[in-house]
């Protein structure tokens, strides 16, 4: 039975040509984390971070993501192009599959708002 | 390019317990971040994942079996195992060890790449 | 567990046609997913991964496709060697789970 739940920094917002931190956390449930998967909006993967295996970034990420901190990413140098939906996806064993959602806007650096808990100065 | 080759009895008496062994050549089992994997096919059947251990010795057994699996690794002989306990005739098949992952770090997958020749093991009084 | 489903069953091709297989997932399973070729008294070989990319000497005329819950393995011009049994499997989600097989005969 799956128990757990998936927290997220929800909607986020963050500079254009600046970095951000995407974070998904499971909670409330006992099940081991196997592997993390961060999907893009148009269902590419960015990166997979494997407990076993450990990282792999995309090739076409390959500049613009770095892994971490812990099982979350880091894109960089964001563009207008980056504004979108996010998926964690959580493979757990016994457990399952969770999945997470964030929201992303890339906003001209005149008028960004961000929240600074997750934000790259 | 490691190699998996499998060994073990090919006969094991109903109720006994199925025990069976993957040598690893080509490459060292401890310093290699994979999952090392048993996956059998009983005959003209289908084939059916038994379970996996990583580098990390977590094991993930599949369900309908985990009460009577145990996957091991003797990284001093190269080696992992497979142990299946109280075995009966639907246990009979082809017994295959396999690596999962060995082209993650590349390509970013997770599958079975490399596998053993396989085993045949018949359970039978 | 993900439940996977091939169909056909079986199917007869003559060489040099094109062979077409299916592969269903209980729930989806995003791209997770590889397709495996077994000729009798062999393992299994590696095909397929990521649904759609050809592991390492796959010859091009082997090509994956789909995502989510419906797959298609695609053999375009069928050589004597291909005929043999394909399984489909998703991965990472545990437990591993593979599809019951489709046979490609010489019809």
């Known amino acids: 039975m799956m128990t757990g739940t998936i927290e997220t920094t929800g909607n986020i917002s963050a500079k254009k040509g600046g970095s951000v931190i995407l974070q998904c956390h499971l909670s409330s449930t006992m099940a081991q984390v196997t592997q993390v998967n961060w999907e893009q909006h148009d269902h590419s993967l960015l990166a997979i971070r494997n407990a076993e295996l450990g990282w792999h970034i995309y090739p076409a990420f390959k500049d613009r993501v770095a892994p971490g901190p812990g099982l979350g990413l880091t894109l960089q140098s964001l563009t207008m192009n980056d504004t979108g939906e996010y998926f964690c996806t959580y493979h757990t064993y016994p457990d399952g599959t969770y999945r997470g959602r964030i929201f992303l806007e890339v906003l001209e650096s005149s008028v960004a708002e961000h929240s600074a808990r997750f934000q790259i100065p | 390019q490691l190699q998996l080759q499998e060994s073990g009895p090919g006969l094991v008496k109903p109720s006994e317990t199925l025990s069976l062994t993957c040598t690893v050549s080509?490459?060292?089992?401890?310093?290699?971040?994979?999952?090392w994997a048993w996956i059998r096919q009983p005959p003209g059947k289908g084939l059916e994942w038994i379970g996996s251990i990583g580098t990390s010795g977590s094991t993930y057994y599949n369900p309908s079996l985990k009460s009577r699996v145990t996957i091991s690794v003797d990284t001093s002989k190269n080696q992992f195992s497979l142990k299946l306990s109280s075995v009966t005739a639907t246990d009979t098949a082809v017994y295959y060890c396999?690596?999962?992952?060995?082209?993650?770090?590349?390509?970013?997958?997770?599958?079975?790449?490399?596998w053993g020749q396989g085993t045949m093991v018949t359970v039978s009084s | 567990e993900i439940v996977m489903t091939q169909s056909p069953a079986t199917l007869s091709v003559s060489p040099g046609e094109r062979a077409t297989l299916s592969c269903r997932a209980s729930?989806?399973?995003?791209?997770?997913l590889a397709w495996y070729q077994q000729k009798p008294g062999q393992a299994p070989r590696l095909l397929i991964y990521g649904a759609s990319t050809r592991a390492t000497g796959i010859p091009a005329r082997f090509s994956g496709s789909g995502s989510g819950t419906e797959f298609t393995l695609t053999i375009s011009s069928l050589q004597s060697e291909d005929f043999a049994v394909y399984y489909c499997q998703q991965s990472p989600p545990w437990p591993r789970t593979f599809g019951g097989g489709t046979k490609v005969e010489i019809k």
């Open positions: 080509g490459g060292s089992i401890s310093s290699s971040r994979y999952y």
């Open positions: 396999a690596i999962e992952g060995a082209n993650f770090r590349d390509f970013g997958y997770v599958a079975f790449d490399i």
């Open positions: 729930q989806s399973v995003s791209s997770n």
